[in-house]
Interface confidence: low
Amino acid sequence: YDFTNCDFEKIKAAYLSTISKDLITYMSGTKSTEFNNTVSCSNRPHCLTEIQSLTFNPTAGCASLAKEMFAMKTKAALAIWCPGYSETQINATQAMKKRRKRKVTTNKCLEQVSQLQGLWRRFNRPLLKQQ
């Protein structure tokens, strides 16, 4: 999916108002310095591409993020504020429902969510028009 035409300011508002808090809740009890940020992004569409990938694509050692509160709110924000996004995700969602069985918070998942926090921070870094 091409995130170029998303309403970035609305997504930013969704992140600041709720998604960020859910990410912090997920990471509660983890030191902020425990994981190094190794994933980055160069512009807002790129950031959303990386955020989508880390949030919804199962990885080795962490297959259980898609049903977390922050993930569901992320999906809702993208569906509302990115034209045509929800249509592209129908097949992926159905496949995910078949695959997902139980919630397991692994160290790998914590690391992945730490990367997500970094990507979201990158997405939300101050714009000049807001200085």
Epitope: S32, S42, N43, L127
Partner: antibody, heavy 120, light 107 residues
Framework: EVQLVESGGGLVKPGGSLRLSCAAS????????MHWVRQAPGKGLEWVGH??????????DYAAPVKGRFTISRDDSKNTLYLQMNSLKTEDTAVYYC???????????WGQGTLVTVSS | SYELTQPLSVSVALGQTARITCSGD??????VHWYQQKPGQAPVLVIY???ERPSGIPERFSGSNSGNTATLTISRAQAGDEADYYC??????????FGGGTKLTVL
Amino acid sequence: EVQLVESGGGLVKPGGSLRLSCAASGFTFSDYWMHWVRQAPGKGLEWVGHIKSKTDAGTTDYAAPVKGRFTISRDDSKNTLYLQMNSLKTEDTAVYYCAREIYYYAFDSWGQGTLVTVSS
Amino acid sequence: SYELTQPLSVSVALGQTARITCSGDNIGSKYVHWYQQKPGQAPVLVIYGDNERPSGIPERFSGSNSGNTATLTISRAQAGDEADYYCQAADWVDFYVFGGGTKLTVL
């Protein structure tokens, strides 16, 4: 008002070392990725390197010509950015600017620059 | 390595429109920024993110970016616009890349 003030420049012999400082004020320094950019006399701008904010791990990246010789650090408690320059070469002669990065990888605030001259 | 190419100099008559180009491979896929630098002074950001203007920069300054060329347009050029102009973009390998600079002369 955002302000960046560099200091520490001067004349140094080839192979020598120098440490530049950049004092920041007027914004939350710790939130920003900070950079050094240089400009040789009569030449264009050249990116030297940057240090990310602590929330983004505080890691550094450098341009190829200075990698292994220059080290960027920051002291968020003092709102200060540093550039440690070792094994200086004559081609490092330039005005060194510190700059604040905003979104899109652009530099919205620059210091006035400090001149480093490497000459025997 | 990624390179940005600018003309060494551009001339414009007072009150006319100046266009400064910045060429790079598929530059349209990157955000491009433009800086104005007057002699003995630090650079000043005049356009960021292809076409966004920082507060305090006149509406006469605008930018565009597509394909292999980004363009800084200065309408109704004034004597005070005389300066060196640099384009800049971020590259995944070379990080932050500047063009060689263009000297704008207002006739």
